[in-house]
Amino acid sequence: LYFSRDAYWEKLYVDQAAGTPLLYVHALRDAPEEVPSFRLGQHLYGTYRTRLHENNWICIQEDTGLLYLNRSLDHSSWEKLSVRNRGFPLLTVYLKVFLSPTSLREGECQWPGCARVYFSFFNTSFPACSSLKPRELCFPETRPSFRIRENRPPGTFHQFRLLPVQFLCPNISVAYRLLEGEGLPFRCAPDSLEVSTRWALDREQREKYELVAVCTVHAGAREEVVMVPFPVTVYDEDDSAPTFPAGVDTASAVVEFKRKEDTVVATLRVFDADVVPASGELVRRYTSTLLPGDTWAQQTFRVEHWPNETSVQANGSFVRATVHDYRLVLNRNLSISENRTMQLAVLVNDSDFQGPGAGVLLLHFNVSVLPVSLHLPSTYSLSVSRRARRFAQIGKVCVENCQAFSGINVQYKLHSSGANCSTLGVVTSAEDTSGILFVNDTKALRRPKCAELHYMVVATDQQTSRQAQAQLLVTVEGSYVAEEAGCPLSCAVSKRRLECEECGGLGSPTGRCEWRQGDGKGITRNFSTCSPSTKTCPDGHCDVVETQDINICPQDCLRGSIVGGHEPGEPRGIKAGYGTCNCFPEEEKCFCEPEDIQDPLCDELCR
């Protein structure tokens, strides 16, 4: 048994006569043999669920669900209740109605076995019938909505009449009907004005019925019509077995370059027309088990269940359904030497499904794990300016397919043929497993005998110690010009184009800072700033070279404070700035301020 609503509303007036009928509550059956029996909770409740008093005023007919006044609620009774309402004006009280034999404790009132009946209290007597508007004669102030379980026996779930109005204003004729399309499963009995289902409902065919209730009032010669929405929601039960969309029960996958723990190797989708169990229960009741195979497979893979609500079309309306994605996921980083082929089976069980048929599916994953071999091109050729400053990025080395790698830890090293010409360094980028070449020793760069630098690049897989090697030839170009000691160490200090371009700074490949002119569009990623190289700084990302010294690119790497209009970077730096952004790395501060109009360059442009 279950209530067709979780809440009911009616009005109560002072000194309303004992015996006045108030409203009907309705229960629907889960099984044909069930017979509803209603009982009232013992207490009246007020604002914020305050227990006000034992209910001495309202009774219920246990078999019909009719609530009526047992005794009149006079002023003194009302004041007694108001005093107990924690000082709030008592505008609404409510009662709990339980379905027997459901043995719910009085404290809890949860649908489906309990409903609340709210009474709006008016500190006046019942108004004259002639003063009541048609809307007040027809429907309660709060619009009802109904919940009906699918596949359950048909039954009565609503009664249209406002009983106190019918009782106190017998001369006013009120008629009701439901506006509904042909073939809908509801009927309104013209005599009793009871609304019932004609047959059991199927949520998978239709989930919501947006009906309209029409009320016609006859008072003397006057006839008025009032319409209100009459929504019915069909509640789901687990009556659909899981299926494979388009019959696809097998997925094939190749594990090669993406070998990182938590990588999704393959996905299979399961469709279920139901939306139960609810999300909190779903993973516990809708189980997936990787069937025992070899130990290696059990340790290497896991299955992740990702349910998602979707909507599908049924009979011209959309109803909710569930798609379950089952992802085969790497449980650990795979060594580049692993080389296996296997078939994995996953058992999916919709444990709440009662049939007909089975709620069990078998998913198949065909997985090939391929080994990865490390290869470098035979030779790299690069050039570097003699004026390049320390930490200037001059190029990249990368084993074949390194951009596609994940979960493969490759470290790059440089071995110099001439000890006194060991100018460059290399660091491995976590983003793409490449090695970034940078200037590490500017003094060596200036030595005349270091005009050509010869290195061996060695790439080593940390897990297996497998290696690849390549020659690196670096040509040192240009002549050295002594850096002015007064120039800031960081290009980012300079606030104007002229002072930016007359100095170098850490990370500058040319020995001169570069000015990036912004787009001037408010707080923008493209703010004006001075940079060692606009290719790498700022780009919204503090790369592995820039992390070595805050003076290289504080715009991307600063963890300190940013003053002025800006959007902070995640997790550091300036994501977007207003006007021109300059930084003082030693003070751990950046400033984003409007463009400085006094720049002589602006005068040139204006001319």
Epitope: E484, A485, G486, C487, L489, D549, I550, P585, E586, E588
Partner: antibody, heavy 119, light 107 residues
Framework: QVQLVESGGGVVQPGRSLRLSCAAS????????MVWVRQAPGKGLEWVAF????????YYVDAVKGRFTISRDNSKNTLYLQMNSLRAEDTAVYFC????????????WGQGTMVTVSS | DIQMTQSPSTLSASVGDRVTITCRAS??????LAWYQQKPGKAPKLLIY???SLESGVPSRFSGSGSGTEFTLTISSLQPDDFATYYC?????????FGQGTKLEIK
């Protein structure tokens, strides 16, 4: 507040050694270059040595090259000047000062410590 | 090394006077010049950097100008607290050098 305090000065015989220390507080010491500047009695200021914020580069005035060594311990917020083979002309008040890499000027100074080289 | 020469060596002036001290570099130092003030028994104090930028907290009566090899420090209206010795210093190269100083005394 931002502060530099020198210590280690005193009277020493020619040819002997002395180590000066400069304790920094109130700022991120490891972000700043540091210098030693000296002032002989009744004379002007003379720059002695400079060290980068990370210790990677050091510069000295010709008169002390090969005899003095500037160093720093960023974990202790302390700057040092190791003075070997001291001469009478090294007698002076020795100041340590902060040099921000953004400006390279000496914006914060200690109160100085007196070194007297005399037999 | 770059030599820095200040003139005059001594300057006598009265409260309220406008005074100018000159500093000359032996070769171009762009704008990489600072001015310091020192009082007897005290550490020097930075007044001006990059030839004309006023250090924060320094009164606006102090100003600097010049570039290349010729630089000046101007005090627009002398105050009693301004009588001290003033040094210029170049930082164009890592052999930082100071001028010999200008002593500003009360007339």
């Amino acid at each position: 507040q931002v502060q530099l305090v020198e210590s280690g000065g005193g009277v020493v015989q020619p040819g002997r050694s002395l180590r000066l220390s400069c304790a920094a507080s109130g700022f991120t010491f490891s972000n700043y270059g540091m210098v030693w500047v000296r002032q002989a009695p009744g004379k002007g200021l003379e720059w002695v040595a400079f060290i980068w914020y990370d210790g990677s580069d050091k510069y000295y005035v010709d008169a002390v090259k090969g005899r003095f060594t500037i160093s720093r311990d960023n974990s202790k917020n302390t700057l040092y000047l190791q003075m070997n083979s001291l001469r009478a002309e090294d007698t002076a008040v020795y100041f340590c000062a902060r040099s921000g890499p953004s400006r390279h000027v000496f914006d914060i100074w200690g109160q100085g410590t007196m070194v007297t080289v005399s037999s | 090394d770059i030599q820095m020469t200040q003139s005059p060596s001594t300057l006598s002036a009265s409260v309220g006077d406008r005074v100018t001290i000159t500093c000359r570099a032996s070769q171009s130092i762009s704008s990489w010049l600072a001015w310091y003030q020192q009082k007897p028994g005290k550490a020097p104090k930075l007044l001006i950097y990059k030839a004309s930028s006023l250090e924060s907290g320094v009164p606006s009566r102090f100003s600097g100008s010049g570039s290349g090899t010729e630089f000046t420090l101007t005090i627009s209206s002398l105050q009693p607290d301004d009588f001290a010795t003033y040094y210029c210093q170049q930082y164009n190269s890592y052999s930082y050098t100071f001028g010999q100083g200008t002593k500003l005394e009360i007339k």
